[in-house]
């Protein structure tokens, strides 16, 4: 003979557990159907009548299959600096991560609870690593031979250019400023050629310089104040 | 829906200690309270400890209280029993169920359970 099905609600054997979308009520000390998501249990089960359902009201939802009394309120709109990704609706709840240049400085269940703006590095210092969904941008002192001149969350050291003749060296924040190999009658005090570059940037190898046929005073032109060390802008 | 397997069981002297751990699979354990069961043969399933989904609030058995620590990880979708100065009457096999948005303790019911762990305290 085929086994009998049982209609919930119904005693379980004992050891036994419930079925698929049954629970154990504690109280009625049967197994009882659960609420499919988007609904709660209006009605407990009894030992002689089965769980009683209804949808979510407006702003609240279950995202489970359950016999909760009431819905989940859903969270509170997304602020300014979050974007909705996924909206309220009676089976799920709403969703805000960090619009782009944010991350997360404060995870909730699911989404972000606060956002923070993303570090930018100063000129004299790179991305050292980037920031993501979770985590801030790390900056790094620009090391020798490699520079930076931007405010930025994404900008990393580049390389020096590298010069036939250098007119002015390049530091931590200014990139090398190169002469023309031809020597200039008509030079006005101060003035600075456009770089010429011998080679790409992406050589990291810097030669020795050539003896420069710029003035050697253009080697004391003052650079600007120093960043501080951090290097990071408290944007 | 949550599967869960219960490890940590093992054989250990009076007043030794076992970390029992409760592993969620198919769903992630942190919309659900937790409860942990016991069975000795031939008596009733009693509900030991439990945590709710938020994870704000615990409960204990009288039997229990001062002994076990309940404990969640939601970032492991792990739950644990830490139980210490055990003794002869804390063997059982122990389980441990679920309850979806479960917001009090003892859980007013029950979801799907684990095979369960044995834990023997004897000299």
């Known amino acids: 003979l085929p086994a009998q099905v049982a209609f919930t609600p119904y005693a379980p054997e004992p050891g036994s557990t419930c079925r698929l979308r049954e629970y154990y009520d504690q109280t009625a000390q049967m197994c009882c159907s659960k609420c499919s998501p988007g609904q709660h249990a209006k009605v407990f089960c009894t030992k002689t009548s089965d769980t009683v359902c209804d949808s979510c009201e407006d702003s609240t939802y279950t995202q489970l299959w359950n016999w909760v009394p009431e819905c989940l309120s859903c969270g509170s709109r997304c602020s300014s600096d979050q974007v909705e990704t996924q909206a309220c609706t009676r089976e799920q709840n709403r969703i805000c991560t960090c619009r782009p240049g944010w991350y997360c400085a404060l995870s909730k269940q699911e989404g972000c609870r606060l956002c923070a703006p993303l570090r930018k590095c100063r000129p004299g210092f790179g991305v050292a690593r980037p920031g993501t969904e979770t985590s801030d941008v790390v900056c790094k002192p620009c090391a020798p031979g490699t520079f930076s001149n931007t405010t930025s969350s994404t900008d990393i050291c580049r390389p020096h250019q590298i010069c036939n003749v250098v007119a002015i060296p390049g530091n931590a924040s200014m990139d090398a400023v190169c002469t023309s190999t031809s020597p200039t009658r008509s030079m006005a005090p101060g003035a600075v050629h456009l770089p010429q570059p011998v080679s790409t940037r992406s050589q990291h190898t810097q030669p020795t310089p050539e003896p420069s046929t710029a003035p050697s005073t253009s080697f004391l032109l003052p650079m600007g104040p120093s960043p501080p060390a951090e290097g990071s802008t408290g944007d | 829906e949550v599967q869960l397997v219960e490890s940590g069981g093992g054989l250990v002297q009076p007043g030794g200690s076992l970390r029992l751990s409760c592993a969620a699979s198919g769903s992630r354990l942190d919309y659900y309270a937790v409860a942990w069961f016991r069975q000795a043969p031939g008596k009733e399933r009693e509900e030991v400890s439990c945590i709710t989904y938020s994870g704000g609030s615990t409960n204990y058995a009288d039997s229990v209280k001062g002994r076990f620590t309940i404990s969640r990880d939601n970032a492991k979708n792990m739950v644990y029993l830490q139980m210490n100065k055990l003794k002869p009457e804390d063997t059982a096999r122990y389980y441990c169920?679920?309850?979806?948005?479960?917001?009090?303790?003892?859980?007013?019911?029950?979801?799907?359970w684990g095979q369960g762990t044995q834990v023997t305290v004897s000299s």
């Open positions: 169920t679920t309850e979806p948005y479960g917001s009090s303790c003892p859980l007013s019911g029950y979801d799907t």
